[in-house]
């Protein structure tokens, strides 16, 4: 699911998640991540894949939390 631009102001990154991916992204395909802005209507973690795709995920999902721990540790 591509992220969509938010029109709420000059935030960086200026994107919000409106839907979440319906599948897990293999860990080895992920290069980076960021949290969407707190003013977005839904919380979101955006994973950036090695191919440059942005994928919106639900921060409450166990696998998302575990991926983030991995990336913080490495």
């Amino acid at each position: 699911t591509k992220t969509e631009s938010s029109s709420r102001g000059p935030y960086h990154p200026s994107e919000c998640c409106f839907t979440y991916t319906t599948y897990k992204i293999p860990r080895q395909r992920i290069m980076d991540y960021y949290e969407t802005n707190s003013q977005c209507s839904k919380p979101g973690i955006v994973f950036i894949t090695k191919r440059g795709h942005s994928v919106c995920t639900n921060p409450s999902d166990k696998w998302v939390q575990d991926y983030i721990k991995d990336m913080k540790e490495n």
Epitope: P26, W63, K69, D70
Partner: antibody
């Protein structure tokens, strides 16, 4: 074909400790999400024990009743262990290793070992 | 603690018939649909049949159908075959735990 094999099951006395090992064949945990242990007492149903995230951070999740007495660990890229302590007769069961390798957001156990039998008796 | 209750057990039906198994969770599974069904035959490990409440696992015939959301779920097996005789378990995933139902034995006569 991916497979899991459990080992370490034994006949032990009450109060004893035991370590069970789950070994993955033809895949490593980089292609898995969660590795788990499930047990089944003779003639009874399935009981979830614990899961460990297969990535480097190795986050662990336990059934309430298993916390403090059972410990799940990832000991290599292809092995997971379950340490059992203070065993009682109620822990007598077949212990299954189960893996979640599917891409669904939910983590379901699509890969199972054949199980290893733990018998606790004096 | 989350409790998954399965009914009825056991259940029997004739070859070619239909059986329905219910699974009720004491609280909503995560995302309302993180529920699976497993088939277990005597002396064998369980086999994933349905995941995400209604999706068919790989290699499972379309005679198996899962439905439901939140706390109430159903597994329906139609056009029963002798090979469907087994114990079926529901399994829910919650925010940080998993759990199994008590199992329902299906006997195909």
């Amino acid at each position: 074909c991916q497979s899991l094999e459990e080992s370490g099951g034994d006949l032990v006395k009450p109060g004893a400790s035991l370590t069970l090992t789950c070994t993955a064949s033809r895949f490593d945990f980089s292609s898995a999400y969660y590795m788990c242990w499930v047990r089944q007492a003779p003639g009874k149903g399935l009981e979830w024990i614990a899961c460990i995230y297969a990535g480097s951070s190795g986050g662990t999740y336990y059934a309430t009743w298993a916390k403090g007495r059972f410990t799940i660990s990832k000991t290599s890229s292809t092995t997971v262990t379950l340490q059992l302590t203070s065993l009682t007769a109620a822990d007598t069961a077949t212990y299954f290793c189960a893996g979640s390798t599917g891409n669904s957001r939910g983590s379901y156990f699509n890969l199972w070992g054949q199980g290893t039998l733990v018998t606790v008796s004096s | 603690a989350q409790v998954l209750t399965q009914t009825p057990s056991p259940v029997s039906a004739a070859v070619g018939g239909t059986v329905t198994i219910n699974c009720q969770s004491s609280q909503s599974v995560y995302d309302n649909n993180w529920l699976a069904w497993y088939q277990q035959k005597l002396g064998q490990p369980p086999k994933l049949v349905i995941y995400d409440a209604s999706k068919l696992a790989s290699g499972v015939p379309s005679r198996f159908k899962g439905s439901g959301s939140g706390t109430h779920f159903t597994l329906t097996i139609s056009e029963l075959q002798c090979d469907d005789s087994a114990t079926y378990y529901c399994q829910g995933e919650y925010s940080d735990i998993w759990g199994f139902g008590g199992g329902t034995e299906v006997v195909v006569k």
